[in-house]
Interface confidence: low
């Protein structure tokens, strides 16, 4: 039975050119997280496992850096960026937990800096 | 959980250097990452470097040619080598490890003359 919760920065912005935290949290299970996925829609951005460590998918590499935590930055941010992001936890014995999150890429002028995600 | 301890803070002049250090120790999920981050006075936390266990690092524009992270991966620590220091750079210094939470309680860096 999977009791677990997955927690996430929710409904963003951010100005183009800029930097954002992608953030989800698993809570609420006992589970043992054997690896987080995040996926733009249907492109893998990067993988972190327990074992294997951090990979990140080469078309990204220069404009993503792992962390904090189980999250993602991601620098340099056009327009195109924009749009929905998925973290899929693969959790033993649960099985996978995704969480969504949707981010909105601005021009400098007309972003909300209200909405933007700040770490606690 | 994970506990996280900086140090190496200061007060140091424009163009001087100094040298951060973050301890971890706890459960830490083995994927090998630490980073840090900082907050200037009135402003959001902000991303300036990680390192990976397998040596790949990545650096915030704002650092990039001054700053240079590392990792001691026997001794669960990160370090943050930073030179050619700037007033812009002052702000709590904080790590970070791939534990949640996994926040420290940071080191204050005051660059000026």
């Known amino acids: 039975m999977m009791t677990g919760t997955i927690e996430t920065t929710g409904n963003i912005s951010a100005e183009k050119g800029g930097s954002i935290i992608l953030q989800c949290h698993l809570s609420s299970t006992t589970a043992q997280v054997t690896q987080v996925n995040w996926e733009q829609q249907d492109q893998l951005l990067a993988i972190c496992n327990a074992d294997l460590g951090w990979h990140i998918s080469p078309s990204f590499k220069d404009r993503v850096a792992p962390g904090p935590g189980l999250g993602l930055t991601l620098q340099s941010l056009t327009v195109n960026d924009t749009g929905e992001y998925f973290c899929i936890y693969h959790t033993y014995p649960d099985g996978t937990y995704t969480g969504r999150i949707f981010l909105e890429v601005l021009e400098s002028s007309v972003a909300e800096h209200g909405a933007r995600f700040q770490i606690p | 959980e994970v506990q996280l301890v900086e140090s190496g803070g200061g007060l140091v002049q424009p163009g001087g250097s100094l040298r951060l250090s973050c301890a971890a120790s706890?459960?830490?999920?083995?994927?090998?990452?630490m980073g840090w981050f900082r907050q200037a006075p009135g402003k959001e936390r902000e991303w300036v470097a990680s390192?990976?266990?397998?040596?790949?690092?990545w650096y915030a524009d704002s650092v990039k040619g001054r700053f240079t992270i590392s990792a001691d991966n026997s001794k669960n620590t990160a370090y943050l080598q930073m030179n050619s220091l700037k007033p812009e750079d002052t702000a709590v210094y904080y790590c970070?490890?791939?534990?949640?939470?996994?926040w420290g309680q940071g080191t204050l860096v005051t660059v000026s003359s």
């Open positions: 970070t490890t791939d534990s949640l939470p996994g």
């Open positions: 706890g459960n830490t999920f083995s994927g090998g990452f």
């Open positions: 390192v990976l266990r397998g040596g790949y690092t």
